[in-house]
């Protein structure tokens, strides 16, 4: 038997993938286990195994359809077990009634590229991928940029409380190398969080014209 | 500039059904929901369903689910609400909306039907 | 069902005041709740989504907040095209339900 307190987290990208992670504290490492997924008003069901992520956790992706398509809807409710394989028969580790779209974590953004750089700003761009049309615009972003002998993490926070797809970086420093994240979540769902960070993406501001006032 | 354009006023007899049509314009209606909501004179807002374009599904209230059709023709960017078994209580104004499925953007100018015999 | 409570069910206001109008719901519905504004012989007009955040295009007059399952309207300084009827609604469980309304009027 497993002991130990177990911890049961899943996410929905809001279109047709939901990414569940299972801790559990003394579980055997060489365990077979799933996480199985029952809407309650869909004739579809769908399972992914498990696979170790740390010393005691697993993941796995509940792939529910094409990227793109809308496989749960604002008023599903899914079941999700996480079933373990002790000898010859499955155990019932967690369950919970899962509510996708108060669950949410979209994908990161996409196809960054500057759109234009000066000395001291730049414009970025961005795509959300894999997001319902049921968000509309509300949408908001948080956005990053590494200055050099800085971290990730020191990088002061830029929010955009709306769905723009696009900032215009102030106040940089002329022929300097830098790079920009770009993360996203909607507004709705009690449960919901940031997406994760972007790809980051490095450019470099013009250098300063010789002989002027900069 | 988003718009939703309602059919005009009904005047029904009990037992009878009405369809309501709402034109939509400036967004792409193939991605959208389009809500139904009654109001009847003096009473509150009642939400009766939506249809999801995209997903091609639609959702009803429990009060409503077993008299009302809502569909869409995607061709002309046109949603419908059809009420059949009407009665007096019908008598409202019907309002169809855009939105997500959780509040209403974006509201038609209401469709008046009036239920006598 | 969830049933939406609007109180008081008339207000009596003087332009230039502040008005705050309630809204509870029967049971938690987390932030999933929403305003709107009706004046005679329109359509509602959505202000207010989960809770507090504004939809542009709303005076910065117009807040929300939330206590529990309690929320609250509040226009800081009544202007003349504020007296209206405002709804709230929840979208945490299916159906979606509206309050019965609160009639906002001049005092």
């Known amino acids: 038997a497993v002991n130990g307190t177990s911890r049961f987290t899943c996410f929905y990208n809001s279109r047709a993938n939901i990414s569940c992670v299972w801790s559990q504290d003394g579980a055997l490492q060489d365990t077979s286990c799933q996480v199985h997924a029952w809407p309650d008003r869909r004739r579809w069901n769908q399972t992914c195994e498990l696979l170790p992520v740390s010393q005691a956790s697993w993941a796995c992706n509940l792939i529910l359809g094409t990227p793109d398509s809308q496989k749960l809807t604002a008023v599903d409710i899914v079941t999700l077990r996480v079933m373990c394989r002790e000898g010859v028969r499955w155990r019932m580790m967690a369950i919970q009634d899962f509510k996708p779209f108060e669950n949410l974590r979209l994908m990161a953004p996409i196809s960054l590229q500057v759109v234009h750089v000066e000395t001291h700003r730049c414009n970025i761009s961005w795509k959300i991928s894999q997001a319902s049309h049921y968000f509309e615009r509300h949408l908001e972003f948080e956005a990053r940029t590494l200055s050099p002998g800085h971290t990730w993490e020191e990088a002061p926070l830029m929010t955009l409380k709306q769905k723009q797809e696009w900032i215009c970086l102030e106040t940089l420093t002329p022929d300097t190398q830098y790079e920009f994240q770009v993360r996203v979540k909607p507004l709705q769902g009690e449960f919901t969080t940031w997406s994760p960070w972007s790809q980051p993406l490095a450019f470099r501001t013009k250098p300063a014209a010789l002989g002027k006032d900069t | 500039e988003v718009q939703l354009v309602q059919s005009g006023a009904e005047v029904k007899k009990p037992g009878a059904t009405v369809k309501i049509s709402c034109k939509v314009s400036?967004?792409?209606?193939?991605?959208?929901?389009i809500h139904w909501v009654q109001q009847a004179p003096g009473k509150g807002l009642e939400w009766m369903g939506w249809?999801?374009?995209?997903?091609?599904?639609?959702e009803y209230a429990p009060g409503f689910q077993d008299r009302v059709t809502i569909t869409a023709d995607t061709s002309t960017d046109t949603a419908y609400m059809e009420l059949s078994s009407l009665r007096s209580e019908d008598t409202a104004v019907y309002y169809c909306?855009?939105?997500?499925?959780?509040?209403?953007?974006?509201w038609g100018q209401g469709t008046t039907v009036t239920v006598s015999s | 069902e969830i049933v939406m409570t609007q109180s008081p069910a008339t207000l009596s206001v003087s332009p230039g005041e502040r008005a705050t109008l309630s809204c509870r719901a029967s049971?938690?519905?987390?932030?999933?709740l929403h305003w709107y504004q009706q004046k005679p012989g329109q359509a509602p007009r959505l202000l207010i989504i989960?809770?507090?955040q504004s939809i542009s295009g709303i005076p910065a007059r117009f807040s929300g907040s939330r206590s529990g399952t309690e929320f609250t309207l509040t226009i800081s300084s009544l202007q003349s095209e504020d007296f209206a009827v405002y709804f709230c609604?929840?979208?945490?469980?299916?159906?979606?339900?509206f309050g019965q309304g609160t009639k906002l009027e001049i005092k």
């Open positions: 909306a855009r939105g997500g499925p959780w509040f209403l953007s974006y």
């Open positions: 400036g967004f792409n209606f193939k991605y959208s929901l």
């Open positions: 249809i999801d374009n995209e997903a091609g599904e639609t």
């Open positions: 049971q938690i519905i987390s932030n999933n």
């Open positions: 989960y809770g507090l």
């Open positions: 609604q929840q979208s945490n469980n299916f159906p979606y339900t």
